[in-house]
Interface confidence: medium
């Protein structure tokens, strides 16, 4: 399997909500000793591989903003704690999962990094992760949406 | 911050079964694997297994045959079970916190387990 | 099962002095490494995951590098309090093993 980002880098103004999105690609197994573990964090486009560091976003961790189920199965990460930090992460039937983070701050630019990682409970663990770019602009330069730019092209959307 | 605490008998009989307990707190359980690992008197750590709150499980198959780990989430709780134990079982016996993908970023502050008659 | 070899057992070193310790595995395990440090009466505590990421609060002078087979934790210049057993572990397939650890000890 793998994962995909429909956008690699979201340009959205201050106090703007997000959503950022990944979608898990190919066969699934459903197999009852497989286990999908599914979060973000944010990371660095480090000298040895993108994603390889895993810092918190907004103080929450992977641990924290993990989604756990099998196969494609819908799933959500603990709303309290989680919503006290202007985050929910969510999945659904299809593949899809993503983080919406609310009221965005400056502070919140940077790389951002989806990870599925697949445990074979009694094998391995097999990990695949996307990456995407945030920036949270101020001032006349400022969009009045977010702006994403696809992944394959440079081709930009306004979402409201 | 999630922390981890070790309980259970210092003295357990050869043959008999070693049981342990690790209380998780300042965390949901929901979010980890959770591990046991050990470490006899003077030695290397040795990986014994892990559980995930949903109930899955994975041991090493050096000790398979003899464990058990379960877990009780109304409790923040997960248990070892460690049957038909010998002297070569004595051990400081830890816990410990993994993010799939990651590493064992949290420990509890373990527990020497001896057995002897 | 993959075996992680460390050497050497023992390193004498004296404080502000770089240290080198190596982890070889028994088959690649690519970049999927940690290195912990152990004090005597002490859990583990975890340095580096992944090869060479720092975890959170550990200071720059703990570095890693490598990937596959053979790996490396260096200590830039060693702090009194760095003086302990290092570990090596690989999680990439079960079960999850670890090195027999270095000793860093004050010469």
């Known amino acids: 399997f793998k994962v995909a980002t429909p956008y690699s880098l979201y340009v959205c103004p201050e106090g703007q909500n997000v959503t950022l999105t990944c979608r898990l690609l190919g066969p699934v197994d459903k197999g009852h000793d497989v286990t999908f573990y599914k979060t973000w964090y944010r990371s660095s486009r480090g000298e040895v591989q993108t994603c390889s560091e895993a810092r918190p976003i907004r103080n929450l961790t992977a641990a924290d903003l993990h989604l756990h189920h099998g196969g494609h199965q819908a799933a959500n990460t603990s709303h309290d704690l989680a919503q006290r930090h202007g985050l929910e992460s969510a999945s659904d039937h299809h593949g899809n999962f993503s983080i919406t983070m609310r009221n965005l701050t400056l502070l919140d630019s940077g790389l951002y990094c989806c990870l599925v990682v697949e445990i074979r409970h009694h094998h391995s663990e097999h990990r695949v992760h996307g990456a995407m770019e945030l920036q949270v602009q101020t001032g006349k330069d400022a969009p009045s949406n977010c702006v994403v730019y696809p992944s394959s092209s440079q081709d930009s959307e306004n979402i409201t | 911050q999630v922390q981890l605490q070790e309980s259970g008998p210092g003295l357990v009989k050869p043959s008999e079964t070693l049981s342990l307990t690790c209380t998780v707190s300042?965390?949901?359980?929901?979010?980890?694997?959770w591990s046991w690992i050990r470490q006899p008197p003077g030695k290397g750590l040795e990986w014994i297994g892990y559980i995930y709150y949903s109930g899955s499980t994975n041991y090493n198959p050096s000790l398979k045959s003899r464990v058990t780990i379960s877990v009780d989430t109304s409790k923040s709780q997960f248990s070892l079970k460690l049957s038909s134990v010998t002297a070569a079982d004595t051990a400081v016996y830890y816990c410990a916190s993994d993010i799939p993908a990651f590493a064992f970023d949290i420990w509890g502050q373990g527990t020497m387990v001896i057995v002897s008659s | 099962e993959i075996v992680l070899t460390q050497s050497p057992a023992t390193l004498s070193l004296s404080p502000g002095e770089r240290a080198t310790l190596s982890c070889r595995a028994s088959?690649?395990?690519?970049?999927?490494l940690a290195w912990y440090q152990q004090k005597p009466g002490q859990a583990p505590r975890l340095l580096i995951y992944d090869a060479f990421n720092r975890a959170t609060g550990i200071p720059a002078r703990f570095s890693g590098s490598g990937s596959g087979t053979d790996f490396t934790l260096t200590i830039s210049s060693l702090e009194p309090e760095d003086f302990a057993v290092y570990y090596c572990q690989q999680r990439i397939n079960w079960p999850l093993t670890f090195g027999g650890g270095t000793k860093v000890e004050i010469k």
């Open positions: 300042g965390g949901s359980i929901s979010s980890y694997y």
């Open positions: 088959q690649s395990v690519s970049y999927y």
